[in-house]
């Protein structure tokens, strides 16, 4: 006899990175017929939802109208069909951004490089933080961590055209509270210099569409919640 139901999927809309004072919805998708969903935050019960009618609904939403550092952290959800509970979902790391200050991002040896050149990003923030995060915009949120007193180096090593794209960095005050994003830095990697076509292989977006990027990133992954779950889950490990 089955003791538990399959674990639900958990994700955040529009994104797991939420600017402070902005809204976010945590989604939990289980099975049709689930009579109760529980959202847990940092290991404790945070909210309950009982869908009506349960046989027509397999997803619930927990709305956070005003994101702040107290709401940032690890979320998971479970659901119940009759008396049988599911396994807990993977952990969702919900991050509050736009805290305190804005770092500056620079790229060495410059924004235009040749395939094979060694590239390093530098993220600098003069306030009290020792962890930095470098993100490449695009369909998947590639995140690297770096450490340093006021700046961190992110060596990409010899680059290929796959490194083309727009990068931003954040200072991290703790795992779930990040600074404002830096201004974007666009890296152009030329494979064959004779052919200076610079169309990036990952979709990238202009400086003023960071919000759109976040939405696009999430939308792209909504089709596969497992992938998004995995991305979010591994982001801060």
């Amino acid at each position: 006899q089955q003791q538990t139901l399959p674990k639900p999927f958990i994700w955040a809309e529009p994104h797991f990175m939420v600017p402070k004072e902005k809204q976010v919805t945590i989604c939990c998708q289980g099975n049709y017929g689930a009579v109760e969903y529980q959202l847990h935050f940092e290991g404790s019960l945070f909210a309950v939802d009982r869908p009506k009618p349960p046989e027509r609904i397999n997803k619930v939403q927990f709305y956070i109208p005003d994101m702040n550092s107290r709401m940032a952290g690890q979320y998971s959800c479970i659901y119940r069909v009759g008396e049988l509970w599911s396994e807990p979902s993977n952990l969702l790391d919900l991050v509050v951004t736009e805290m305190y200050d804005t770092p500056t991002l620079s790229v060495h040896p410059g924004p235009e490089v040749i395939s094979g050149e060694k590239v390093t990003f530098y993220c600098r923030l003069d306030t009290a933080t020792s962890m930095f995060l470098l993100l490449k915009e695009g369909r998947s949120s590639h995140v690297q961590r770096g450490y340093g007193k006021v700046q961190a180096e992110f060596p990409l090593g010899p680059v290929t055209t796959a490194h083309r794209g727009t990068y931003r960095c954040f200072g991290s005050y703790n795992n779930h509270a990040w600074s404002f994003p830096s201004e974007p830095v666009k890296l152009l990697v030329t494979g064959d210099i004779e052919n200076t076509s610079l169309a990036p292989e990952d979709p990238t977006f202009p400086a003023d569409t960071w919000g759109t990027y976040l939405l696009t990133t999430e939308t792209g992954l909504q089709k596969d919640h497992a992938l998004w779950d995995h991305t979010a889950q591994n982001l801060l490990r």
Partner: antibody, heavy 117, light 107 residues
Amino acid sequence: QVQLQQPGAELVKPGASVKLSCKASGYTFTSYWMHWVKLRPGQGFEWIGEIIPSNGVTNYNEKFKRKATLTVDKSSSTAYMQLSSLTSEDSAVYYCTIRLRYALDYWGQGTSVTVSA
Amino acid sequence: DIQMTQTTSSLSASLGDRVTISCRASQDISNFLNWYQQKPDGTVKLLIYYTSRLHSGVPSRFSGSGSGTDYSLTISNLEQEDIATYFCQQGNTLPPTFGGGTKLEIK
């Protein structure tokens, strides 16, 4: 067009310091690394170091770490290099140069530093 | 640091000549080799980057070749305005390093 303007010459006494300037125009000053290079008569160029104006990150040649200090003034798009405890070995032409694309593609005219009592 | 060696410190040639200047690196620099021209008045210009790519505005009589540790700059039809000192520079590893220069004179 891209321009890097440097004063022509500086005469300084041994043991003193000198601050060389390089005023940039024609490109986004904060986005590109400013390099400084030394050229002594009859010798090759020596790379001193570089600075990125956006956040002041620097890389130095180990040989010049105690000799040169690189700074920038973003408001005037000017880069500076201070040379300290000058000796006759520091008499040289000093160039500022930037990499806009794939190499050091724009150079200043150079400042000739003469260290003499 | 990577050592860059230009074995010929000076070179005499006639106008119209084909001139080749060589440069050797102390280790493989993966084609990240640039050539610069310093005119007698001190002006410095980039000629060639990434071994063989002509910088914009540089006459096509200049060309570069090489791989691994050995590189060369060729001027196919020497003109009066080419009288200068030529330096190679590796951009593969920090710190960037330069050759000692080859001074080109007219016979």
